[in-house]
């Protein structure tokens, strides 16, 4: 399914537990269209099946076009008084939309990542804190569940809990964005 849109070690800590981030603007500060792949260069693809979209992690054949995702970036502010784990200040949050009106969402109960059709304003489950990592990789941390990241499990996207004391170096939560 092609996109129908027109248009590293991490640089800091985790989102504080139990924190309330306020997104400082209802419109994104910027947007970009990029393909998403894993640290091991498998592609994230999206397919319409039985009137709903499925998300796959797979090796693409050489000539197959990669699916593009619209990434919309928002700023969010942490009041210092709320930061229990030593992270306060301005964070970069992102929503990911592979096709018009559909957004990736965290399902924390099922520990899954799903595509849902929804209208704006988007629910909190559609927002992820963006972490830059070395090797120009990124990670996506759930706004609704700090310490939980989008990751790869059994050739699917899943929500993966990362211990706060860990270095967040696990490759299964690292992704590459390619705008070409």
């Amino acid at each position: 399914m092609g996109s129908s849109h027109h248009h590293h070690h991490h640089s800091s800590g985790l989102v504080p537990r139990g924190s309330h981030m306020s997104i400082t603007g209802i419109s994104p500060i910027t947007e970009s269209l990029a393909s998403l792949s894993t640290y091991n260069d498998q592609s994230i693809t999206f397919a319409l099946e039985d009137e709903s979209y499925e998300i796959y992690v797979e090796d693409l054949k050489k000539d197959k076009k990669k699916d593009k995702v619209l990434l919309s970036y928002y700023e969010s502010q942490h009041p210092s008084s709320e930061s229990g784990d030593g992270v306060d200040g301005k964070m970069l949050m992102v929503t990911l939309s592979p096709t018009k009106d559909f957004w990736l969402q965290a399902n924390n109960k099922e520990h899954s990542v799903e595509l849902h059709k929804c209208e704006k304003p988007l629910p909190d489950q559609a927002f992820f804190v963006l972490h830059n990592r070395s090797f120009n990789c990124v990670s996506f941390e759930c706004k609704t569940d700090p310490g939980v990241f989008i990751g790869v499990k059994d050739n699917h996207l899943a929500l993966i809990k990362v211990d706060y004391s860990e270095n967040l170096g696990s490759e299964n939560i690292l992704f590459k964005l390619s705008e070409t």
Epitope: H8, S11, S12, G13, V87, D88, L168
Partner: antibody, heavy 122, light 107 residues
Framework: QVQLVQSGAEVKKPGASVKVSCKAS????????ISWVRQAPGQGLEWMGW????????HYVQKFQGRVSMTTDTSTSTAYMELRSLRSDDTAVYYC???????????????WGQGTLVTVSS | DIQMTQSPSSVSASVGDRVTITCRAS??????LAWYQQKPGKAPQLLIY???SLQSGVPSRFSGSGSGSDFTLTISSLQPEDFATYYC?????????FGGGTKVEIK
């Protein structure tokens, strides 16, 4: 208010090392990454590398690899940059700069130290 | 590495003039570009980030635009305090890189 205060000017001989400090105040130190940027006299800005104040992870520009070390001391909210085997072309003002997003380097540097002049001369 | 090329390297202008500085990247990226102002003997100051977002406290006469390979900083009406050197910086990927600078001088 946010402040980054750097150590004073240094004069070093070729082959020596220099360690520049950058003391942060006015924000939670371990929330933001710190980069080091240098500027030779009359020249432009050159990024040297970055360190996460949260966990000490770092990334150095290839040309400085093996000669530079960036560290942090969270107990004193201070970042350090050590440059070894100094040469005359390392003469520059060295700046520390805070990344403007807590978890991302995409936003540039929103606060800078006042700069430390390092002169390398025999 | 992404190389950033700024033009012009210097520009002479008068108070009240509209000044435009361009920055071209050796390879395209989305919008993670910042602009800084630097005065002699001082540290740079962030003006614009994400190509077009105005940093808090920066006067609205400064604006940024562009994406891909070409970016622009515009000063709509030059003020006496705006005579300085301006740098672009790509914040898209490591290594982070700066343009060579544009000196805005008094005509």
């Amino acid at each position: 208010q946010v402040q980054l205060v750097q150590s004073g000017a240094e004069v070093k001989k070729p082959g020596a090392s220099v360690k520049v400090s950058c003391k942060a105040s006015g924000y939670t130190f371990n929330s933001y990454g710190i980069s080091w940027v240098r500027q030779a006299p009359g020249q432009g800005l050159e990024w040297m590398g970055w360190i996460s104040s949260h966990n000490g992870n770092s990334h150095y520009v290839q040309k400085f690899q093996g000669r530079v070390s960036m560290t942090t001391d969270t107990s004193t909210s201070t970042a350090y940059m050590e440059l070894r085997s100094l040469r005359s072309d390392d003469t520059a003002v060295y700046y520390c700069a805070r990344h403007s997003y807590t978890t991302s380097w995409y936003g540039g540097f929103d606060y800078w130290g006042q700069g430390t002049l390092v002169t390398v001369s025999s | 590495d992404i190389q950033m090329t700024q033009s012009p390297s210097s520009v002479s202008a008068s108070v009240g003039d509209r000044v435009t500085i361009t920055c071209r990247a050796s390879q395209g990226f989305s919008s993670w570009l910042a602009w800084y102002q630097q005065k002699p003997g001082k540290a740079p100051q962030l003006l614009i980030y994400a190509a077009s977002s105005l940093q808090s406290g920066v006067p609205s006469r400064f604006s940024g635009s562009g994406s891909g390979s070409d970016f622009t900083l515009t000063i709509s009406s030059l003020q006496p305090e705006d005579f300085a050197t301006y740098y672009c910086q790509q914040a898209n990927s490591f290594p982070l890189t700066f343009g060579g600078g544009t000196k805005v001088e008094i005509k």
